[in-house]
């Protein structure tokens, strides 16, 4: 396959995410491990200078000193290698100057725990700038323990760079992870350095290791997957919802009922109504009207919206939710005020989410 570079001879375009490097070939500064490195920001009239490494803001620390237009790295390590930029902010504009730092080392291995590189997918460097694999986005790797409910999808990421472009392979419990090792196999997306397993089951529990390697070195990172079997329960309704509401005649109002249920819930909005002037039937049970329920023709059953309300709409509204294990209900009252008694509240159009799975 042809080699390529994300380094392009164009300026940063407005629609590009800021993590894509689109620059002319940067200057390369080479240092040996343990050496100190000093780079001067080659920009004129710089009022304020800010520094980034691989797209991430760079601040001073015990090894990085930022003085005026100078960046000093004390006791350089391979982890300091990367694409640096200094940005000069002026009153009318800003300008950025990019440069590469390459701390040459024999072989890098293991987890680069404190690497804070940016969120690049894969950066292929200048073809003569050989480099062992390195992590490009440790933020996406911080969560090592994944406790995932059965039947969910899980995604493990190991974003990396290197030159030549490293390859990635996956191990399960220290052994080669093959498609036939799980029902339905798994998906690997090399472009995004990730492994996906859909519909996880208890037998998927274990340690998953990505091994990223090229001819100059190898690095690896291990995740632990725990598959949690769901314990079914009756629906749980969020406390305080639906909330009492008031509006003027002709106004609009919304009741929200937030439902937590593993099993598929059925949501009903019910109102006490009167029949022939009575709230109760001959059997002593109240007259109820189902105003809305979840189903094919009902969108967002967790929200009951009432438009152009009249005094007859006042009363108690019940959110009743059931699943195959049991049911729960909570209610709220609607007060309808005459037009001149408008309740003062900020005009806000909001939407509530549907039930939680």
């Amino acid at each position: 396959r042809p080699s390529f570079s994300l380094v392009e001879d164009t300026t940063l375009e407005p629609e590009e995410p800021p993590t894509k490097y689109q620059i002319s070939q940067p200057e390369v500064y080479v240092a040996a491990p343990g050496e100190s490195l000093e780079v001067r920001c080659l920009l004129k009239d710089a009022a304020v200078i800010s520094w980034t490494k691989d797209g991430v803001h760079l601040g001073p620390n015990n090894r990085t000193v930022l003085i005026g237009e100078y960046l000093q790295i004390k006791g350089a390590t391979p982890r300091d290698s990367g694409l640096y930029a200094c940005t000069a902010s002026r009153t009318v504009d800003s300008e950025t100057w990019y440069f590469m730092v390459n701390v040459t080392d024999a072989i890098s291995s293991g987890d680069d725990e404190d690497d804070t590189d940016g969120a690049e997918d894969f950066v292929s460097e200048n073809s003569n700038n050989k480099r062992a694999p390195y992590w490009t986005n440790t933020e996406k790797m911080e969560k090592r323990l994944h406790a995932v409910p059965a039947a969910n999808t899980v995604k493990f990421r190991c974003p990396a760079g290197g030159n030549p472009m490293p390859t990635m392979r996956w191990l399960k419990n220290g052994k080669e992870f093959k498609q036939e090792h799980r029902i339905g196999g798994y998906k690997v997306r090399n472009q995004h350095w990730s492994l996906i397993m859909e519909s996880v089951v208890p037998s998927d529990k274990g340690n998953y290791t990505c091994v990223v390697e090229n001819e100059y070195g190898s690095i690896n990172h291990t995740y632990h997957l725990d598959v949690v079997e769901r314990s079914p329960h009756r629906p749980i309704l969020q406390a305080g919802l639906p909330a009492n509401a008031s509006t003027v005649v002709g106004g609009d109002v919304e009741f929200v009922c937030k439902v937590y249920s593993d099993a598929q819930p059925h949501i009903q909005w019910i109102k006490h109504v009167e029949k022939n002037g009575s709230k109760y039937g001959p059997d002593g049970l109240p007259y109820l009207k189902v105003l809305k329920h979840s189903g094919i023709n009902s969108s967002n059953a967790e929200v009951l919206a009432l438009f152009n309300v009249t005094e007859a709409d006042a009363g108690e509204y019940i959110c009743k939710v059931s699943n195959y294990i049991g049911q729960a209900n909570q209610s709220a009252w609607l007060t309808v005020l005459p037009k001149q008694q408008a309740p003062g509240r900020e005009k806000e159009i909001t939407a509530s989410p549907d039930y939680l799975e």
């Epitope: 994300l6 392009e8 590009e16 995410p17 409910p149 997306r189 472009q191």
Partner: antibody, heavy 117, light 107 residues
Framework: QVQLVQSGAEVKKPGSSVKVSCKAS????????ISWVRQAPGQGLEWMGY????????HYAQKFQGRVTITADESTSTAYMELSSLRSEDTAVYYC??????????WGQGTLVTVSS | DIQMTQSPSSLSASVGDRVTITCRAS??????LAWYQQKPGKAPKLLIY???ILQSGVPSRFSGSGSGTDFTLTISSLQPEDFATYYC?????????FGQGTKVEIK
């Protein structure tokens, strides 16, 4: 400026195939994956599949598996989406979209495919 | 596949209103969520990615929040050009799925 330019509208008979092209200009084509997304009249967006030219990866949505083929020609910076065994419900606007970091940042203008006997 | 449930399916609002649209995933998707705006006859336009990062050139009145399963797109003060349909997209699973859309109409 990176742009994705798609081929023109097509009218097809049920049972036939359609091949829509998407040409990239102004950027490194093989650095990114290209996804195809369709939208039936008055409906929402539906992802069909992607191709990652550099990595040589393709992945299709289960719904279109066996009926859709996505290819790319790096020499012309063009991605293609071919949908076979067309039926009336395949009438839609088909979009190509460039993946930046997994999400789609740049879209083609869309190609209307009408399936009618 | 991961299901994305967007609500409401439509809403009417006035210029200057604060508008909130919600998207819920059928399982945790970390922060792998993007929001798009689409106007009739046009391709979708990326507004927000990684749940809360504003795409370059998008006005700051748009903001995103959430994590795990519940996500929100907020337009702090609706402008005439914001009347459109909005979609969420999950990219946690590579079988990408969109929400069904929220049409924001003029009241």
């Amino acid at each position: 400026q990176v742009q994705l330019v798609q081929s023109g509208a097509e009218v097809k008979k049920p049972g036939s195939s359609v091949k829509v092209s998407c040409k990239a200009s102004g950027g490194t084509f093989s650095s990114y994956a290209i996804s195809w997304v369709r939208q039936a009249p008055g409906q929402g967006l539906e992802w069909m599949g992607y191709i990652s030219p550099y990595m040589g990866e393709t992945h299709y949505a289960q719904k279109f598996q066996g009926r859709v083929t996505i290819t790319a020609d790096e020499s012309t910076s063009t991605a293609y989406m071919e949908l076979s065994s067309l039926r009336s419900e395949d009438t839609a606007v088909y979009y190509c979209a460039r993946e930046s970091y997994e999400y789609f940042d740049i879209w083609g203008q869309g190609t209307l495919v009408t399936v009618s006997s | 596949d991961i299901q994305m449930t967007q609500s409401p399916s439509s809403l009417s609002a006035s210029v200057g209103d604060r508008v909130t649209i919600t998207c819920r995933a059928s399982q945790s998707i970390s922060n792998d969520l993007a929001w798009y705006q689409q106007k009739p006859g046009k391709a979708p336009k990326l507004l927000i990615y990684a749940t809360s990062i504003l795409q370059s050139g998008v006005p700051s009145r748009f903001s995103g929040s959430g994590s795990g399963t519940d996500f929100t797109l907020t337009i702090s003060s609706l402008q005439p050009e914001d009347f459109a349909t909005y979609y969420c997209l999950q990219y946690y699973d590579y079988s990408y799925t969109f929400g069904q859309g929220t049409k924001v109409e003029i009241k």
